[in-house]
């Protein structure tokens, strides 16, 4: 723990005038001027009534104010003469003395009160020297520290009982211990007095140091009986925009050009690419002009920008469909979430005077029109002989942050003659054991003159297709077998080629013994 603080309540070492303590009887302890080890003048008390037996000499200090202290420490410096070195003395010679104290709410003691005895005086300890000295030696100074408590009154007296020693009380110091104010875990703990017992732990509440925030509570530190801190509970940590300094006793603001996004003990970091700070204590660096962070980007990610346009858009027109392909933009803006949008515009009028407007909703984009990851799209259901402009936009996660529209590459195309659309419905006119007679409506969008129709059909059980052509919108399928199910599809042909097959329609031949009577029936797709 941290080093303990000691505060003096009384110290004879600094008293140069008479101490004038009370002694009983007067023939006992005697105040004498002397010198300490450094030859400073000091006031001491001596007693040496060793030739008479049954000694009971008391010495009492002046009143000492407690100052809210619960436990007091007493440091005694003294010398004791070795009984064996004194000739012709009775066996009552002692080499120890007793330390007492007495509590009072004011300076009430007198020459006769309290009575000179244990109880009312409270015994602290019998003090024995580590070393005693003979007459021929220099006096060997012993130092002893004792403590007592808990104290509750305004002050106290110390008392010393001699029972036949030859000794000198060189200095007496009464003091108490406290834990010094300290900083631990980015929290400040105030100076705290020790408790009443040596084993006491006194709780000191803490407060976070400036620019720190609590990370676990309660914030407390325990001050033990020796004035040392122990068992920290709770902690603070540096707030965003601040970093630890001076061995975790300070949280210093991040200098300009650096930031700290999260609270904690990490250091401030230089701003990510394309960002800056203009003031200290930044928790995020702001992006340079035309650079942005997406909502999903963390504070420690670089600022990025929008991609440049796609390159090399190539169109491959096939009648009223086309395939667009392109290459990646030269500059991805520093991101890897690139997507493409394809904007379709239908143009009217000629040359420079043409006006373009958004395409109809029925134009189909495969795999999709917006949010393409592929650099290829198939576009169909366009009008024949029509001019279109396609804009291929490059976008990324910060395109929505930019005030400017996405950058794009445009391509102009003109559609060709379209193949006819699908034949809508097939109608059964008659069936027999070996034939089916079918008719159909022409396509809704023939896109030109229909040259002929091709019919594909197969027996469902066999599954092998045959084809026939017809210049009319009806046909008789021969060579079939009775009681069999057939699937039939038709498509129209113009100079632009074949259209799509109609959806599969199903018909059944009659049994061989059946009449083959006409069964007029419109057959919608399966």
């Amino acid at each position: 723990g941290c080093r303990a603080l000691e505060e003096t309540l009384m110290d004879t070492k600094w008293v140069t005038s008479e101490l004038a303590w009370t002694s009983h009887p007067e023939s006992g302890w005697e105040e004498v001027s002397g010198y300490d080890e450094a030859m400073n003048p000091i006031r001491t008390y001596q007693v040496c009534n060793v030739r008479e037996s049954s000694q009971n000499n008391w010495l009492r200090t002046g009143f000492i104010w407690r100052r809210d202290v619960q436990r007091v420490y007493v440091e005694l410096k003294f010398t004791v003469r070795d009984c064996n070195s004194i000739p012709n003395i009775p066996g009552s010679c002692k080499e120890t003395f007793n330390l007492f104290y007495y509590e009072a709410d004011s300076d009430v003691a007198s020459a006769s009160s309290p009575f000179w005895m244990e109880n009312p005086y409270v015994k602290v300890d019998t003090i024995a020297p580590d070393e005693s000295f003979s007459r021929l030696d220099a006096g060997r100074v012993n130092t002893k520290v004792r403590s007592f408590g808990p104290l509750s009154k305004a002050g106290f007296y110390l008392a010393f009982q001699d029972q036949g020693a030859c000794m000198s009380l060189i200095s007496v110091r009464a003091f108490y211990k406290k834990c010094a104010s300290t900083t631990a875990g980015f929290a400040l703990f105030p100076e705290t007095l020790t408790g009443a017992e040596p084993t006491s732990l006194v709780i000191a509440p803490g407060t976070c140091i400036p620019n720190a925030v609590e990370v676990s509570v309660p914030l407390k530190l325990y001050c033990n009986g020796d004035g040392e801190w122990m068992v920290p509970v709770g902690a603070c940590t540096c707030a965003t925009g601040h970093e630890p300094a001076a061995k975790e006793s300070q949280c210093r603001p991040c200098p300009p050009g650096s930031y700290k996004a999260k609270q904690g003990e990490g250091p401030c970091l230089p701003c990510p690419p394309n960002s800056r700070t203009t003031s200290p204590a930044a928790s995020i660096c702001t992006c340079h002009n035309n650079f942005y962070r997406a909502d999903s980007d963390s504070a420690d990610s670089a600022c990025t920008t929008v991609p440049s346009p796609p390159r090399g858009v190539i169109s491959n027109v096939n009648e009223t469909s086309l395939i667009l392909e392109w290459s990646e933009p030269r500059d991805l803006g520093g991101r890897d979430d690139l997507l493409y949008n394809v904007i379709c515009k239908k143009c009217h009028g000629a040359g420079g005077a043409s006006a373009c407007s958004r395409c109809d909703d029925n134009v189909e984009f495969v795999p999709r029109q917006l949010g393409l990851t592929e650099r290829r799209v198939h576009i169909s259901h366009l009008l024949a002989h029509t001019r279109y402009t396609f804009e291929v936009q490059a976008v990324n996660g910060v395109s929505g942050k930019s005030p400017l529209p996405p950058r794009y590459a445009a391509v102009n195309i003109t559609t060709n003659q379209a193949a006819p659309s699908e034949v809508p419905t097939l109608r059964l006119h008659s069936s027999s054991g070996s034939s089916l007679t079918l008719s159909w409506a022409p396509p809704e969008r023939p896109n030109g003159v229909i040259l002929d129709y091709e019919m594909k059909y197969f027996e469902k059980s066999e599954g092998i297709a045959s084809t026939v052509t017809s210049q009319m919108n009806s046909v008789q399928l021969d060579g079939l077998r009775p009681d069999a199910r057939y699937v039939v599809q038709v498509r129209a042909r113009t100079v632009a080629g074949y259209g799509q097959y109609s959806r599969p329609a199903e018909f059944e031949t009659t049994s061989e013994r059946g009449s083959g009577a006409q069964q007029l029936q419109e057959q919608l797709p399966l």
Epitope: E459, I464, R481, E512, L526
Partner: antibody
Framework: QVQLQQPGAELVMPGASMKLSCKAS????????IHWVKQRPGQGLEWIGE????????NYNQKFKGKATLTVDKSSSTAYMQLSSLTSEDSAVYYC??????WGQGTTLTVSS | DIVMTQAAPSVPVTPGESVSIPCRSS???????????LYWFLQRPGQSPQLLIY???NLASGVPDRFSGSGSGTDFTLRIGRVEAEDVGVYYC?????????FGAGTKLELK
Amino acid sequence: QVQLQQPGAELVMPGASMKLSCKASGYTFTSYYIHWVKQRPGQGLEWIGEIDPSDFYTNYNQKFKGKATLTVDKSSSTAYMQLSSLTSEDSAVYYCARGISSWGQGTTLTVSS
Amino acid sequence: DIVMTQAAPSVPVTPGESVSIPCRSSKSLLHSNGNTYLYWFLQRPGQSPQLLIYRMSNLASGVPDRFSGSGSGTDFTLRIGRVEAEDVGVYYCMQHLEYPLTFGAGTKLELK
């Protein structure tokens, strides 16, 4: 392209039933009959029956009536053949086919205790 | 049931030569609609059967033109011109005139 996916192998106890599956893709499922054919180890081919997925019409070889039941699930484009009261004689490779032109890889059924 | 007979269980052939595989039916497979409902399949080792010829003489899609089919109402022949190693397997004839559909016992083509 047309695909008929069948599990590679199935092991079943004698007396039990087993439902073999045939998942079709790459064509309009309801436009073609599904045929089932049996081939015993080292033997020739035996036609079991056919089913029309559009209306569940079935045609069985008399020999397999009571042994095989053909069904389809249009929503998953899957045809099934349930074989009941299995014996060692039913151990064989069972093929499904789209019409007679495209065949699956077959499921090897082993009936053993 | 119509019985399909493949008299030759196996036919040995030298690669590059041609070979004919016969098949006979117990009833005429010629329908009144003009089609003969006879089909040929090849089953290569470890594989499922593959359609070669449909309605006696029509080549199925994707089948090399060295395969051809011919016959009358009850006697049929599959001819392979210039046999190749990949033609090895068992050849089955099948009738689809009546139910149940029936197969011949198969003829194994072996290279000499």
